[in-house]
Interface confidence: low
């Protein structure tokens, strides 16, 4: 009821609590002497439905049968009107409409932890919509039940507050929620358990690792456990890896070897446990604890390459080159590498330890067979040394690979292909590829790159260091004991025309013919490797279309020769470069008249 | 425990479509990720699809891919797989894993908490 309903009263039958589906009958009855003044036969009673009018009647009561009230609430409020007056409230009621509880199911307990408390859970079914009260029983040996209830209208998990302990590790305890509203009630299946059953170990606690020796192949994991745990699961990774590798281990007693761990590397380790073989859950994951192994000292070998140059009669210039040992081979932190130069016949040897660089270049005289030998230091040792004999890699003719060809892979890739030597193909031991950016003045310190290619291979896919739009000076080797042989070819992965024509600096005359001579367009607007030059020619204030030279592109030319102008006729003179996408625009225009005499 | 319940399996014939269910017990099935797998008479067992918890990111072995869908339904406890242009390399019995801890899984199962008891799916040529 609601208000003091001093003028009347709501009765609600059969009850204020019914089940969904039912009728209701409401009546409204005024008390005496409580209608309208002086005109009780003009008393109008109206049952409001919330604030929505749904009967009427005049008297001194109302009766109004209620269907189809939905699940939940619904407040009725019934008010008086004479006339000449606003409506005067009379009394009110609420309504409550749920369902009978469902049976709880899925009933399940636990206990964290040995000396944790057993908490247990169920699914409610279909909500009530009504005050429910939950009641849960846990029976156990020597027929002792614990008991406890919650009053929350979504009540799906209680804590007894209880422990159950080992003493009887196979003693039977059995759980049951039972759930009761005003209409009906409902119990779970029993749920029958064992202390072995419902304990969930704490996760393990306190873990370490040490390695024996400073060696990552003799490495122990420390930590602590619940004393009854039986079991562990051990899980591992590198730091920067998803995937875990798992260990199961009984009796561990807190300690397990790990063999199979890789030097210097940050690795995750997480360690859960059980207290019987098939009984129970796995606790929690432990806290994560990260530990870097060990080094160890480095496996595999540099890869080595090399070039040379001539200095003048007595000197050339070796340039050593190698690349970093992969992570796994590394082992640890390369501290430095060795590099040791040795003249074979004279038996001088030099060693250098080279840090912060992966190259090294040194003057040695042209005489002599020398030979080196470079391998990679961390805090535990060295790498084998990689030895390789200074050769001239293009001397041997025979051995230079035929019909070299370099084209465009998709993006940022070339596909080299080559045909063996003329040479005996099978001697061949190996091919190498190296490939730089093309510069001009043949920059020395432009960076190398290189790939080695089995002997009877005749491709490959460069993509290291393959920028677009620009050219690259691409050498094939074939390497048979101390000899080799190399052809080189021009490559790009992808190119336009150029974006500007060469520029002419200058024009001279000699012995009747004329001498041009250019400045190399900038590499950056080359848009690839250069094909051709073109030397267009026209009389100054001519229509007529221009004359042209086209001459093949070389690296180190700068100037060309025409001889084909006209004695005191004034010429204006251009230039363009071509890729296989096309020519460039216009260089300058140069205006000349050649001096010489007519023929 | 969390119990897997598949349905939906059957014989049909080739370029037919079928859908599997998984029907799995336990409150916290929005925390599961789920999975499909199969086992082909005479094979090992295979990964098929999983999808995560919140049903966000699917992954499938790439001799489902465009024709198979695993969607979730997490109110209904549900995890289906809609199997379209079947094949008669489809054939095996069909079972349904949860992930529950999160941990690695891996395409032979490792990883996987629970598992269905298994639906059998034929395609006949």
């Known amino acids: 009821k609601i208000d003091a309903c001093k003028r009347g009263d709501v009765t609600v039958k059969p009850s204020h609590v019914i089940l969904l589906g039912s009728t209701v009958n409401i009546t409204c009855s005024l008390k005496p002497r409580q209608g309208c003044f002086h005109y009780s036969r003009r008393n109008k009673l109206i049952l409001y439905k919330f604030d929505r009018r749904i009967n009427f009647h005049h008297g001194h009561s109302l009766n109004s049968q209620v269907t189809g009230l939905p699940l939940g609430t619904t407040l009725f409020v019934c008010k008086l009107a004479c006339i000449n007056s606003d409506e005067i409230q009379i009394c009110g009621a609420e309504i409550f409409v749920g369902v009978a509880p469902e049976q709880p199911q899925n009933l399940s307990c636990i206990q964290k932890g040995e000396q944790g408390t057993v908490a247990c859970t169920w699914e409610r079914g279909r909500d009530t919509h009504l005050y429910t009260e939950y009641t849960l029983q846990l029976s156990g040996p020597k027929n002792l039940t614990w008991q406890k209830q919650c009053k929350d209208i979504y009540c799906d998990y209680l804590d007894f507050g209880i422990n159950l302990t080992p003493e009887s590790p196979e003693s039977n305890f059995t759980a049951k929620v039972t759930a009761v509203n005003s209409l009906g009630s409902s119990s779970s299946l029993p749920s029958t358990f064992t202390f072995l059953d419902i304990v969930r170990p704490l996760p393990p606690w306190d873990i370490r690792i040490k390695f024996q020796k400073a060696s990552v192949s003799r490495c122990t994991l420390y930590w602590r456990d619940e004393g009854l745990v039986l079991l562990n699961r051990l899980r591992y990774r590198p730091s920067n890896s998803r995937l875990w590798n798992m260990v199961n281990v009984t009796k561990a007693k807190g300690r397990h070897d790990l063999l199979d761990l890789k030097p210097f590397t940050e690795y995750e380790f997480q360690i859960s446990s059980k207290l019987h073989l098939y009984k129970g859950s796995w606790s929690d994951w432990s806290e994560s604890l990260r530990a870097q192994t060990p080094e160890e000292e480095p496996t595999g070998m540099l890869d080595v390459w090399y070039m040379k140059r001539h200095i003048d009669y007595s000197r050339q210039q070796i340039s050593l080159f190698w690349k970093n040992l992969s992570v796994s081979e590394a082992r640890g932190k390369i501290l430095h590498y060795q590099v040791t130069l040795q003249e074979l016949t004279g038996g001088k040897a030099m060693t250098q330890n080279i840090t912060g660089h992966t190259s090294w270049t040194t003057v040695i005289p042209r005489t002599g067979n020398w030979a080196v030998a470079v391998s990679a230091a961390n805090s535990k040792g060295s790498s084998l040394p990689t030895r390789i004999n200074i050769m001239n890699l293009c001397e041997a003719g025979l051995l230079a690979p035929r019909q070299v060809s370099a084209n465009s892979e998709g993006m940022d890739n070339i596909l080299v292909t080559w045909q063996p030597p003329r040479k005996d193909p099978s001697a061949v031991q190996e091919y190498v590829v190296e490939w730089r950016e093309l510069h001009p003045g043949g920059d020395t310190q432009v960076p190398l790159n290189w790939l080695r290619s089995r002997p009877y291979n005749v491709s490959a896919l460069i993509s290291e260091n393959i920028k677009s739009y620009i050219c690259y000076e691409i050498r094939v080797y074939a390497l048979s004991g101390d000899q080799g042989g190399c052809s080189s070819i021009l490559g790009n992965s992808k190119h336009k025309a150029p974006l500007s024509g060469p520029h002419i600096n200058a024009i001279t005359e000699e012995k009747g013919s004329i001498l041009i001579s250019w400045n190399s367009i900038p590499v950056q607007e080359q848009m690839g490797c250069l094909l051709h030059y073109r030397i267009y020619w026209k009389e100054r204030d001519s229509n007529s279309q221009p004359q042209l030279c086209e001459i093949p592109y070389r690296v180190s030319q700068n100037s060309h020769p025409i001889n084909s102008l006209q004695p005191r006729v004034t010429y204006v003179l251009w230039m363009t470069a071509l890729t296989a996408a096309g020519e460039s625009s216009h260089g300058n225009e140069r205006e000349f008249c050649l001096q010489g005499k007519a023929n | 425990q969390v119990q897997l319940v598949e349905s939906g399996g059957g014989l049909v014939q080739t370029g037919a479509s079928l859908r599997l269910s998984c029907a799995a017990s336990g409150r916290t099935f929005g925390r599961y990720e789920m999975a499909w797998f199969r086992q082909a008479p005479g094979k090992e067992r295979e990964f098929v699809a999983h999808i995560s918890s919140s049903g966000l990111t699917t992954t499938y072995a790439d001799s489902v891919k465009g024709r198979f869908t695993i969607s979730r339904g997490n109110a209904l406890n549900t995890v289906y797989l809609q199997m379209n242009s079947l094949k008669p390399e489809d054939t095996a019995v069909y079972y349904c894993?949860?992930?529950?801890?999160?941990?690695?899984?891996?395409?032979?199962?490792?990883?996987?908490?629970?598992w269905g008891k298994g639906t059998l799916v034929t395609i006949s040529s």
């Open positions: 894993a949860a992930n529950v801890d999160g941990s690695a899984w891996s395409t032979l199962g490792a990883g996987m908490d629970y």
